[in-house]
């Protein structure tokens, strides 16, 4: 912490300007009034403060706003944002997309994924839902940031907004996030024709249930292996060999090269070997002919 000293009269600060770069840390602490700093935050980013000096300025703001900074200050943080921790950001209430854009630009090229995720979370809370303007801002200024939101936050996305989401925006989404987004996408694209629907729904399919995957297998979609590998394991396991063959079309030969990877490996183990042999790919590891499959989970449920 910066030690307290009194400010020499000749060093008194009446406005935030470039002369402050020559102040030592303890002089900044003693001479800069926090309320003045907050009122003139828009000037701070134009001044080449050292990181040590920025620490002092942050300390000033923290003392003035222990419950969290107001948006008028947040909007003009500039490079001071790089000093913020997720705990600091969690106290904020942000509603302006201009504020979000400004801080996303500052964070670019810095290791700030936790801070950015928290900031986006605060914006969604502040605005009440993940609306189209927010999604547009995220896709433009922070591709992939959509997936930093929790499934709970993503549940506030109206289906009408889903069309603004691009495939690359979903690249880092996990299964729980896709579970939330998939039903919304399905609703958003429901009036599209078969091939157009598949192109649109493809990035969201990691959240699709078995029955939807089975339905796709009847539509000659020729799903590529990259998409197949992103399907939920639970959605793939009940598919028959014939359904997978129809689903993948000409891409079915790719099962061979991915046979060691889940969910392909797990799916192979659940198929009869003679069914797998009909594919002519040399897939091994299926249930040998003549073996009975007892589903013990069903027996346990009955007892």
């Amino acid at each position: 912490d910066v030690e307290r000293t009194t400010c020499p009269p000749e060093k008194e600060v009446h406005e935030i300007d470039e002369s402050l770069i020559f102040y030592k840390k303890r002089e900044l602490e003693a001479c800069v009034d926090a309320a003045l700093l907050a009122a003139q935050m828009d000037r701070v980013d134009a001044i080449p403060f050292t990181y040590e000096q920025l620490d002092v300025l942050k300390h000033k703001l923290d003392e003035l706003y222990p419950q969290g900074y107001p948006e008028s200050v947040i909007r003009h943080l500039g490079h001071l944002f790089l000093k913020m921790s997720p705990e600091d950001i969690r106290k904020w209430n942000v509603t302006s997309l201009e504020t979000l854009k400004a801080l996303l630009k500052v964070s670019k090229g810095h290791e700030m994924s936790a801070q950015v995720a928290t900031l986006i979370d605060r914006v969604v809370v502040g605005r009440g839902q993940l609306d189209k303007d927010t999604v547009d801002t995220l896709t433009a200024f922070c591709p992939g940031c959509l997936c930093s939101l929790s499934p709970e936050r993503l549940s506030s996305v109206p289906p009408s907004v889903i069309g603004a989401v691009r495939p690359q925006d979903l690249d880092t989404c996990g299964p729980r996030q896709l579970d939330v987004l998939y039903p919304k996408a399905r609703l958003a694209f429901q009036n599209m024709s078969g091939s157009e629907y598949f192109v649109k729904i493809r990035p969201f399919l990691g959240g699709a249930p078995t029955e939807d995957v089975k339905a796709l297998s009847q539509q000659n979609v020729s799903m590529d292996l990259a998409t197949f590998m992103k399907l939920r394991r639970e959605a793939v396991l009940p598919l028959t060999v014939a359904e997978v063959q129809k689903l993948l079309g000409p891409h079915v030969e790719g099962l061979k090269v991915e046979e060691q990877h889940s969910p392909v490996r797990d799916w192979i183990l659940k198929q009869r070997q003679d069914d797998l042999d009909t594919l002519g790919l040399g897939l091994q590891g299926g249930i040998p002919n003549g073996y009975l499959i007892l589903d013990l989970s069903v027996r346990e449920a009955l007892s």
């Epitope: 690359q168 590529d224 990259a226 030969e253 889940s262």
Partner: antibody, heavy 119, light 108 residues
């Protein structure tokens, strides 16, 4: 332009570990597996294993089981290979190579990282 | 595992000459699952041919590939100086995926 950028040469002591990054750019990171290949001096190529960046799933050549560990960071579009308990036999150039999921050929190769194990 | 044996290990050819490199597998390889790579000294390997006979993007038409079962070949219809390199065949028909020992091709 599709690129796979690897780090510079590494000089490591026997018994130590090395972690080599492979940063991908210019394509959808999760549509391609990342495979790793070893090339000992003036010799042929040996497949080490691969990782599916979408699921984090890995498979290894049995020869490198316990020796190599592949991990990924989707947010940074980077795959890492850690090589443990290094011996002089591990002195080689290590390449990452992109493989479209469902195909077995490597259409783009990394720049290669030379690892020299010496005391 | 499938062992791929390339022959010859070293060969030299004159400009304009037709060159054939062979790759023999210890057991049958599905032809969709065989590819060829070219590697020049100090550089990374480069995909030349995939699925036995398909030319990779940007590869000159003088290169061609053929074969099935356990016998595969790479042909250069008319040798050029820039073709001096090492060539490796590669199979992913059977786990673990393997490479041939390579053929070093020099220009006379």
């Amino acid at each position: 332009e599709v690129q796979l950028q690897q780090s510079g040469p590494e000089l490591v002591k026997p018994g130590a570990s090395v972690k080599i990054p492979c940063k991908a750019s210019g394509y959808t990171f999760t549509d391609y597996n990342m495979d790793w290949v070893k090339q000992s001096h003036g010799k042929s190529l040996e497949w080490i294993g691969d990782i599916n960046p979408s699921t984090g799933g890995t498979i290894y050549n049995q020869k490198f089981n316990g020796k190599a560990t592949l991990t990924e960071d989707k947010s940074a579009s980077t795959v890492y290979m850690e090589f443990r308990s290094l011996t002089s036999d591990d002195t080689a150039v290590y390449y990452c190579a992109r493989r479209r999921i469902g195909t077995g050929y490597f259409d783009v190769w990394g720049t290669g990282t030379t690892v020299t194990v010496s005391s | 595992q499938i062992v791929l044996t390339q022959s010859p290990a070293l060969m030299s050819a004159s400009p304009g000459e037709k060159v054939t490199l062979t790759c023999s597998a210890s057991s049958s390889v599905i032809s969709s699952y065989l590819s060829w790579y070219q590697q020049k000294p100090g550089s990374s390997p480069k995909l030349l041919i995939y699925r036995t006979s398909n030319l990779a993007s940007g590869v000159p038409a003088r290169f061609s590939g053929s074969g099935s079962g356990t016998s595969y070949s790479l042909t250069i219809s008319s040798m050029e100086a820039e073709d001096a390199a090492s060539y490796f065949c590669h199979q992913w028909s059977s786990f673990p995926y393997t490479f041939g020992g390579g053929t070093k091709l020099e220009i006379k």
